[in-house]
């Protein structure tokens, strides 16, 4: 060892996972979603796991039923705390129809634009939460293809509550929501027995979203 060699006390920086993702959550807010508190609880549990900021993960929320509303844009809030406060205030907008294709398409065309805070080169993730077959399901093929063309990763969540409450077959509904999810479907599609059960998938969903960055 050289006589000039010195031992210096230093602290290695904490390994930081730079989770740069632009995430848009597309929420079904039609009349059949009940109770809405379960949706906001799900949002709270999911969002509090995220490191939200202009140089980290950004989150935007779109709500749809008959029409589509941008609840907040990707660049609206610059911390997890701010987003949590905003998400708690989201009210159910209702609507007699469930226009899922329109909700997804609006998210793709509008929520993921630079004007609304999307960043160039940052991975785009869409999380779609719905409780019923869409009235515009004949438009889904195009909408999903458009998302594919723009490399938007899609996680879809089917809430079976209204089907179970009405003792109805969920087969067609599950098939539709599976078709929305990115491949491999088993890693991108979730179903829950009812709205209250949404919180049970948060951990796995969060892990799978952030695995995208790795």
């Amino acid at each position: 060892v050289s006589p000039t060699f010195q031992v210096v006390n230093s602290i290695a920086p904490v390994q930081e996972c730079s989770t740069q993702l632009d995430i848009v959550i597309v929420l079904d807010g039609s009349n059949s979603i009940y109770p809405w508190d379960s949706v906001t609880a799900f949002l709270n549990d999911l969002l509090e796991r995220m490191d939200i900021g202009p140089k980290q993960t950004q989150v935007g929320i779109v709500q749809y039923g008959e029409n589509v509303t941008h609840e907040f844009n990707l660049n609206k809030y610059s911390s997890t705390e701010e987003v949590l406060v905003a998400a708690k205030k989201i009210v159910q907008r209702g609507g007699r129809q469930t226009m899922t294709a329109l909700g997804i398409d609006t998210a793709r065309k509008e929520a993921f634009t630079e004007a609304r805070g999307a960043r160039r080169g940052v991975k785009k993730v869409m999380v779609i939460v719905t409780d019923g077959e869409s009235h515009d399901n004949h438009r889904l093929k195009k909408v999903i293809q458009d998302c594919e063309d723009e490399n938007i990763q899609r996680f879809s969540i089917a809430i079976l509550g209204s089907y179970n409450r009405g003792n109805l077959s969920t087969e067609k509904f599950v098939e539709e929501i599976k078709s929305i999810a990115s491949e491999p479907t088993e890693k991108h599609f979730f179903n829950v027995s009812d709205e209250l059960a949404l919180v049970t998938i948060v951990k796995t969903l969060g892990e799978r979203i952030f695995a995208l960055e790795a």
């Epitope: 008959e66 029409n67 004949h138 195009k142 293809q145 458009d146 063309d149």
Partner: antibody, heavy 117, light 108 residues
């Protein structure tokens, strides 16, 4: 630019099957951003949607015609086709093919089909 | 199915005048799924407006659209000779896709 051209017999006998083909030029039918539609217009009347197909083969039909309609696609030929079975005089119309994205933005010029013995 | 009712059936106007065409739906239609077409005799329809109010490529700005829910309007601010034709509204949010019965804009 994309152009569409309908082809097929102009005269079909009652109870037979009407068959039309739409050839797409200037663009690929396999580009997944459009549905490929058939629409008809009875003489002096309005427009009626028959159905459409996605390049993957998924079809959507007007329930009023569903039992008699088949739409298919041949991506290798850049064509899609309409078959309407058990025709009657009420099926006499101008048949159009069209590209449907956000509305039907490209149409064929239409072909007149007369059902008569 | 969603029934679209257009009124009036015929509109008789002179060039330079303003034309207002109505399309009423039997149930709510998202404006994103409402389109307007123009058709001249012996020709295929031509897309004018999509999303209820967005002009298609090459459509002059004298054509405008508005409305939401069940009531939609197509306005031609100053009629040109080439605007005399039949106009159709169409919805594609619910299957089956449906067209209105059309409004004929004729020269007075």
């Amino acid at each position: 630019q994309v152009q569409l051209q309908e082809s097929g017999p102009g005269l079909v006998k009652p109870s037979q099957t009407l068959s039309l083909t739409c050839t797409v030029s200037g663009g690929s039918i396999s580009r997944g951003n459009y549905y490929w539609s058939w629409i008809r217009q009875h003489p002096g009347k309005g427009l009626e949607w028959i159905g459409y197909i996605f390049y993957s083969g998924s079809t959507y039909y007007n329930p009023s015609l569903k039992s008699r309609v088949t739409i298919s696609v041949d991506t290798s030929k850049n064509q899609f086709s309409l078959k309407l079975s058990s025709v009657t005089a009420a099926d006499t119309a101008v048949y159009y093919c069209a590209r449907d994205g956000y509305g039907m933005d490209v149409w064929g010029q239409g072909t007149t089909v007369t059902v008569s013995s | 199915e969603i029934v679209l009712t257009q009124s009036p059936g015929t509109l008789s106007l002179s060039p330079g005048e303003r034309a207002t065409l109505s399309c009423r739906a039997s149930q709510s239609v998202s404006s994103s799924y409402l389109v307007w077409y123009q058709q001249k005799p012996g020709q295929a329809p031509r897309l004018l407006l999509y999303d209820a109010s967005s002009r298609a490529t090459g459509i002059p700005d004298r054509f405008s659209g508005s409305g939401s829910g069940t009531d939609f309007t197509l306005t031609i601010s100053r009629l040109e000779p080439e605007d005399f034709a039949v106009y159709y509204c169409q919805q594609y949010g619910n299957s089956p896709l449906t067209f209105g019965g059309g409004t004929k804009v004729e020269i007075k």
